[in-house]
């Protein structure tokens, strides 16, 4: 059997060393405890006994499944404990008494089937993260479980297996900053969201099927919910159940951001928001988050139309990895308030983009994110995109361009291009001379040679880049990154050409440790200020006996440099 | 109504590995969810794991978490479980099941198939 590590400031690492009980010779001089991935099996009530300034204890994956009741009495200074993914198929309030000073606490991932027959947390009063339930057995969910709590910042319920919610049993908890829900169906999901309405900052639902969702209004008072953030991840929407979910909105009229994430859709996409009030009532609403939308008949998809009116006041739209290939026109029309518009990872092309980016397309749009689409034409993407008059931002990276023309159109307000991994062999005068920020890292560019008179930041990392461009092209550069070129020196007067240069890096590039390069470097202490990955990214290439040395630490033979 | 063939089933050695497969008829697979469970003799089936439509989301029982990895290949209607590290409390009938709910609760899987046995000896 191995022994534990130590390190001075007494932080203990005792993972996977095949311990069959915590292990004898523990010291007050402990702080951090880690036990996981062990086989202890039993907790007993004098193995801990020593260690009283303890503040880490983390026991995950060991099988316990026994712990005396007494076991943790000495760690009054205790802050973080985490028992996830043991064998505990019973929790006892015993444990947790002594430990008032406990601000994390993780039990998930055991098979319990309630949280115990009396409170288990009414001495926590520091608590501010709680990790608790189940995929398979924890089933019931009752007043008594959380009392003494009053306030959260994190609170996860695995509760994948629920039967059973006692109303009221999360009203207790007055303040909860983030609450995750993994619910596996929505059959309890309206008597929760009431106890919920008046404490929660961030809900966020887990692998929930809500196909079968049906609002009722909910038994609560006039009430102003706090809540700012809605989120689903796995779970799955029909057209119905979607139109019923808009009708929770109604009590949480500070909702300002909502995300659906690996959600499926049964369904077409034939919303009928009924409710007037509903859309009145979105109004506060932002940011609109759509990450990898599975819809099984994606190609039947409706126009949207019937929800143009609900996203009038939305700013931010992601709708990313989600099989779109067109916006239609009066849809963007209706969008007049979206300023930042992310649809990466789809199906777009420049033929339906066109319909997309019509005359009168999202009259307020500043930033625009098509990567990872099927572009194929940088000079037809620039044309189609001279409708959007406010557009500053545009990323069409990770598409694969032909070659580039000598001369595109581009909205006259363009600051900020991204080029990144779009295959561009060659830099031509299609990219606008107004650019202030400028990717093309990721490419083929063995050359650059584009005056930029306004580009502050320059990101040509992952090129073949041979020497540092000409500083002339770029009089008021400020930010370089430069990384992972064939760049093999670097000199005084070449830094000192770049008048206004705050930032470069320049590491992992194929330098030749000259005598001029290594008596520069020597020379100039400042540069650790300006080459923000030095000196650790700056490793000399040749000559052979220097090959993986620092520069920093290079030193030039006397021989060569003094011949 | 989709059915399933578990196989890949066996005598392994305590520390060994296998990979158990379910095949699923019918072109609606990655519209369940899918579990696997496992019943030893004389004993209660119990949850293993679960896997939500995309692939997106996995959950183990505790007795198998770290061992065992649960993946799917919609395009080729089926779900996995390679399962290393064997030990000898892991012998029993496999089965997978599929169903419209995210749980480990075996009362709400609809569709089951016939079991692949699985013997881990020490």
């Known amino acids: 059997q191995e022994s534990l590590s130590c390190d001075a400031s007494g932080v203990c690492d005792g993972r996977s060393r095949s311990f069959t009980s915590i292990p004898s010779g523990l010291t007050a001089a402990m702080k951090s405890l880690d036990l996981s991935f062990n086989k202890i099996t039993y907790i007993g009530h004098g193995d801990l006994r020593a260690c009283a300034n303890l503040q880490v204890l983390i026991l995950k994956s060991s099988r316990i499944n026994t712990i005396e009741g007494d076991a943790f009495y000495s760690l009054g200074s205790l802050e973080h404990l985490d028992l996830s993914d043991n064998h505990l198929s019973s929790l006892s309030s015993s444990w947790f008494g002594p430990l008032s000073s406990l601000k994390y606490l993780n039990l998930m991932g055991n098979p319990y089937q309630t949280l115990g027959v009396t409170s288990l947390f009414p001495n926590l009063t520091n608590l501010q993260t709680l990790r608790i339930g189940n995929v398979e057995t924890f089933s019931e969910i009752r007043r008594i479980d959380f009392a003494g709590l009053t306030s959260l910042n994190e609170l996860e319920i695995k509760a994948l297996s629920l039967r059973n919610y006692q109303s009221q049993s999360l009203k207790s908890i007055r303040d909860i900053h983030h609450l995750t829900l993994h619910l596996s169906e929505s059959a309890f999901l309206l008597e929760i969201f009431a106890d919920i309405l008046s404490s929660v900052r961030y809900l966020e639902l887990r692998d929930t099927n809500l196909a079968r969702f049906q609002f009722s209004p909910l038994p609560v008072d006039e009430v102003s919910s706090p809540m700012k953030k809605l989120a689903f991840r796995g779970s799955v929407l029909t057209d119905e159940s979607f139109n019923e979910l808009l009708k929770l909105l109604r009590y949480i009229l500070e909702l300002s951001e909502v995300e659906f994430d690996d959600c499926t859709l049964n369904g077409l996409g034939d919303f009928n928001p009924s409710e007037s009030d509903v859309v009145s009532e979105l109004g506060k609403v932002e940011t609109v988050t759509i990450r990898r939308l599975h819809i099984p008949q994606f190609y039947l998809f409706y126009d949207l139309s019937t929800v143009y009116s609900l996203l009038e006041k939305v700013k931010r739209i992601t709708v990313e990895n989600s099989k779109v290939f067109l916006v239609p026109c009066s849809f963007s029309q209706h969008l007049k308030s979206l300023e930042f518009l992310d649809l990466s990872e789809n199906l777009m092309v420049e033929e339906y983009l066109k319909n997309s980016a019509c005359k009168g397309a999202w009259p307020s749009l500043q930033t625009l994110v098509l990567s990872q689409n099927h572009l194929r034409s940088m000079q037809k993407t620039g044309e189609i995109l001279l409708t959007l008059k406010n557009l500053t931002s545009l990323d069409i990276s990770r598409n694969t361009f032909h070659p580039m023309p000598d001369s595109c159109q581009w909205p006259e307000k363009m600051r900020f291009l991204n080029l990144s991994s779009t295959g561009i062999r060659v830099v031509k005068t299609c990219i606008p001379q107004t650019l202030e920020v400028l990717d093309v890292s990721n490419n083929n560019l063995d050359s650059f040679s584009l005056f930029l008179p306004r580009l502050q930041e320059l990101y040509i990392s992952r090129n073949k880049l041979k020497t540092l461009p000409d500083a002339s092209l770029f009089p008021v550069l400020l930010v370089m990154k430069i990384r992972e070129n064939a760049v093999s020196t670097f000199s005084k007067d070449q830094l000192g050409s770049f008048p206004k240069l705050e930032t470069l890096e320049a590491g992992d590039n194929h330098f030749v440790c000259s005598c001029e390069l290594l008596s520069f470097t020597m020379e100039t202490p400042a540069l650790a200020q300006i080459l923000v990955d030095w000196p650790d990214s700056y490793l000399c290439d040749s000559p052979p006996r220097l090959h993986g040395h620092r520069l920093q630490d290079a030193r030039p033979s006397v021989l060569e440099c003094h011949q | 109504e989709v059915q399933l063939v578990e196989s890949g089933g066996g005598l392994a050695q305590a520390g060994g590995s296998l990979r158990l497969s379910c095949a699923a008829s019918?072109?609606?697979?990655?519209?369940?969810?899918m579990g696997w469970f496992r019943q030893a003799p004389g004993k209660e089936r119990e949850f293993v794991s679960v896997?939500?439509?995309?692939?997106?989301?996995?959950d183990y029982s505790t007795y198998v978490k770290g061992r065992f990895t649960i993946f799917r290949d919609n395009a080729k209607n089926t779900v996995f479980l390679e399962m290393t590290s064997l030990e000898p409390e892991d012998t029993a009938v496999y089965y997978c099941?599929?169903?419209?709910?995210?749980?480990?609760?075996?009362?709400?899987?609809?569709?089951w198939g016939q079991g692949t046995p699985v013997t881990v000896s020490s």
């Open positions: 019918g072109r609606t697979f990655s519209r369940y969810v």
């Open positions: 896997i939500n439509r995309s692939g997106g989301s996995t």
């Open positions: 099941a599929a169903g419209e709910y995210y749980t480990g609760d075996s009362s709400r899987y609809d569709h």
